[in-house]
């Protein structure tokens, strides 16, 4: 009976996500058969989040909208480990929007999910950010410094990275 009700709950939860994500890839968390964590197929997973590299070129606003339609946001990077995971799936000759912007052009950077912007956990290329007109952040590769962030014009189309919380069923 208990297993039956758990299965029913899982099915209803899966139906919730079906409109965005017809297919989920789930793994068992720990030793308990009851706990499964899922990411949409073909998203990748790291710790408690799922990531999707969007290769369509769009402005920052459209990229964020594209992520939100999938129940996600443009990526918020919280640690060096998280960035190191993300870059494994990026192409060196491309740039990708992050969920980081300076809406008023005042050098007051903010994350899309309202995570406080912490200057000590940023990975700007040297000399970046450097322009009041460039209000959106990308991650890109520079041969001298490997992967890092740069500020650019928000309306210039780029690829992007979406991030969402893992789905627990």
């Amino acid at each position: 009976n208990f297993m039956y009700s758990k299965t029913v709950k899982r099915l209803s939860k899966l139906r919730e996500y079906q409109q965005y994500h017809p297919s989920l890839t789930c793994v068992m968390e720990g030793k308990d058969i009851e706990d499964w964590s899922c990411c949409p197929t073909p998203w990748t997973s790291f710790q408690s989040s799922c990531y999707f590299i969007s290769t369509g070129m769009q402005s920052w606003t459209k990229s964020q909208k594209n992520c939100s339609v999938m129940g996600a946001d443009l990526v918020v990077i919280n640690t060096r480990e998280e960035q190191d995971f993300i870059i494994q799936n990026l192409k060196r000759n491309s740039s990708y929007f992050l969920g980081l912007s300076d809406p008023g052009g005042r050098r007051h950077w903010q994350w899309v999910d309202q995570t406080p912007y912490n200057e000590n956990v940023t990975f700007w290329h040297s000399g970046e950010p450097n322009n009041l007109d460039e209000r959106c952040a990308i991650i890109n590769f520079r041969s001298s410094e490997e992967w890092g962030w740069n500020d650019i014009h928000c309306h210039v189309p780029q690829k992007s990275i979406c991030k969402m919380k893992k789905i627990y069923i």
Epitope: G105, R106, N131, L132, D133, H153
Partner: antibody
Framework: QVQLQQSGAELVRPGVSVKISCKGS????????MHWVKQSHAKSLEWIGV????????NYNQKFKGKATMTVDKSSTTAYMELARLTSEDSAIYYC???????????WGQGTSVTVSS | DIQMTQSTSSLSASLGDRVTITCQAS??????LNWYQQKPDGTVKLLIY???NLHTGVPSRFSGSGSGTDYSLTISNLQQEDIATYYC?????????FGGGTKLEIK
């Protein structure tokens, strides 16, 4: 080449307003914000503020809030600054300057002299 | 606001001299220090940005250095056309602020 052409000198009475212009050419106007700078004998150069030619929003030096109003007309690639309720303290040369990388003003207009006198 | 101090308001030098103009910020400005030249006719040009980078078309006799709060502009071989007033400007924090200027004259 990049050019910023400012309007001519103004001689105005105290208490009135004046609007000066700065026409940008030789570059994509909406890719670069426009700064305004005041130069008076007493105070050397003072940054008034900056207006985004793309978004239209502005950042003002607190000191010039209520005194200066910056606007932009994309169709004519012209930035404007209006100075209100003029006093002799506002007599100065006013420059427009294009925003550049590394928090710099990379090209400057020739300056507009504003003289406030009764 | 960040205060920018150019302690020398005027400076006299001979053609061919090496001239150094200094600028001090009231707090660390992370190398966001720019130098401008204003000619006697009022024309203003950017010379150096981000402490040490030469703007397009600026002769190589101009150079910049510094870090933290202390910065300098050097003209290695003074020419007649360098007679002007030189201003430093910090871009680290809004509002941007300028030094009081250093007027360069020929001896």
């Amino acid at each position: 080449q990049v050019q910023l052409q400012q309007s001519g000198a103004e001689l105005v009475r105290p208490g009135v307003s004046v609007k000066i212009s700065c026409k940008g050419s030789g570059y994509t106007f909406t890719d670069y914000s426009m700064h305004w700078v005041k130069q008076s004998h007493a105070k050397s150069l003072e940054w008034i503020g900056v207006i985004s030619t793309y978004y239209g929003d502005s950042n003002y030096n607190q000191k010039f809030k209520g005194k200066a109003t910056m606007t932009v007309d994309k169709s004519s690639t012209t930035a404007y600054m209006e100075l209100a309720r003029l006093t002799s303290e506002d007599s100065a040369i006013y420059y427009c300057a294009r925003n550049g990388n590394f928090y710099v003003m990379d090209y400057w207009g020739q300056g507009t002299s504003v003289t406030v006198s009764s | 606001d960040i205060q920018m101090t150019q302690s020398t308001s005027s400076l006299s030098a001979s053609l061919g001299d090496r001239v150094t103009i200094t600028c001090q910020a009231s707090q660390d400005i992370s190398n966001y220090l720019n130098w401008y030249q204003q000619k006697p006719d009022g024309t203003v040009k950017l010379l150096i940005y981000y402490t040490s980078n030469l703007h397009t078309g600026v002769p190589s006799r101009f150079s910049g250095s510094g870090s933290g709060t202390d910065y300098s502009l050097t003209i290695s071989n003074l020419q007649q056309e360098d007679i002007a007033t030189y201003y430093c400007q910090q871009g680290n924090t809004l509002p941007w602020t300028f030094g009081g200027g250093t007027k360069l004259e020929i001896k």
